[in-house]
């Protein structure tokens, strides 16, 4: 014998209190598949969460995070704060990158500047908290007449380009 509830489409539920007829999901609830005996409560996007997609009778609401935060976890279950460029998120909040490291994004960790000398190159532009070092030609390429590029003068302030 076929289960009469199997005929109930998404957006409805099989109402046992009404001879198993298909009733529409009540407001703020949904059923995403047919044959359901209950409708699920819609997710509410509150606080630091904001609504990306409204709940309908057949699909749950979808949330994302308010500006200054980004999603983590399945279905954006958590909101993690953004940091500024030149910072990294630590357990105690956003902290500036230590000297010799940089972060050019709003998330992720500070990474060490490129060591130009490992590739036999010179530093063309000093690194900052927000930007990596730019490596220039190798010193051997800078023989007189070979190039008009000259190595930069040492920065006065560590980690920053000369003003």
């Amino acid at each position: 014998l076929q289960d009469p509830c199997s005929n109930c489409p998404a957006g409805t539920f099989c109402d046992n209190n009404r001879n198993q007829i298909c009733s529409p999901c009540p407001p703020n609830s949904f059923s995403s598949a047919g044959g359901q005996r209950t409708c699920d409560i819609c997710r509410q996007c509150k606080g630091v969460f904001r609504t990306r997609k409204e709940c309908s009778s057949t699909s749950n609401a979808e949330c994302d995070c308010t500006p200054g935060f980004h999603c983590l976890g399945a279905g954006c279950s958590m909101c993690e704060q953004d940091c500024k460029q030149g910072q990294e998120l630590t357990k105690k909040g956003c902290k500036d990158c230590c000297f010799g490291t940089f972060n050019d994004q709003k998330r992720g960790i500070c990474r060490p500047w490129t060591n130009c000398s490992l590739d036999g190159k010179s530093v063309l532009v000093n690194g900052t908290k927000e930007r990596d070092v730019v490596c220039g030609p190798s010193p051997a390429d800078l023989s007189p007449g070979a190039s008009s590029v000259t190595p930069p003068a040492p920065a006065r302030e560590p980690g920053h380009s000369p003003q």
């Epitope: 990294e88 998120l89 630590t90 357990k91 105690k92 902290k95 960790i109």
Partner: nanobody, 124 residues
Framework: EVQLLESGGGLVQPGGSLRLSCAAS????????MSWVRQAPEKGLEWVSA????????YYADSVKGRFTISRDNSKNTLYLQMDSLKAEDTAVYYC?????????????????WGQGTTVTVSS
């Protein structure tokens, strides 16, 4: 599959206590530091506490120091958070999180797996 499942949340009055548990599976539990992190209704994630893989080192956010105690039972693959002297501002969803290394500290933010969370409401 790596999984973390929190339990123990609920409604408690200010000054009361709760003990949260986090059951871990799918990885060598004792090889990884673990953290508790929370998200209050209007705020982003806030790190609460961390414990090293062996359980010998523990760390706490200033906001919970002296009130919360983190522990682990590696034979049961379970992480705990004992919360005493609870305040209204402790109301949040609490997540346990696996860190990427055995040792931990109160600085580096390297959680790589999260549970689904358990809700703690502190209200009179």
């Amino acid at each position: 599959e790596v999984q973390l499942l929190e339990s123990g949340g609920g409604l408690v009055q200010p000054g009361g206590s709760l003990r949260l548990s986090c059951a871990a599976s799918g990885f060598t539990f004792s090889s990884y530091a673990m953290s508790w992190v929370r998200q209050a209704p209007e705020k982003g994630l806030e790190w609460v506490s961390a414990i090293s893989g062996g359980g010998g080192s523990t760390y706490y956010a200033d906001s919970v120091k002296g009130r919360f105690t983190i522990s682990r039972d590696n034979s049961k693959n379970t992480l705990y958070l004992q919360m005493d002297s609870l305040k209204a501002e402790d109301t949040a969803v609490y997540y346990c999180a696996k860190e990427g290394t055995t040792e931990t500290d109160d600085y580096h933010y390297n959680m790589d797996v999260w549970g689904q969370g358990t809700t703690v409401t502190v209200s009179s």
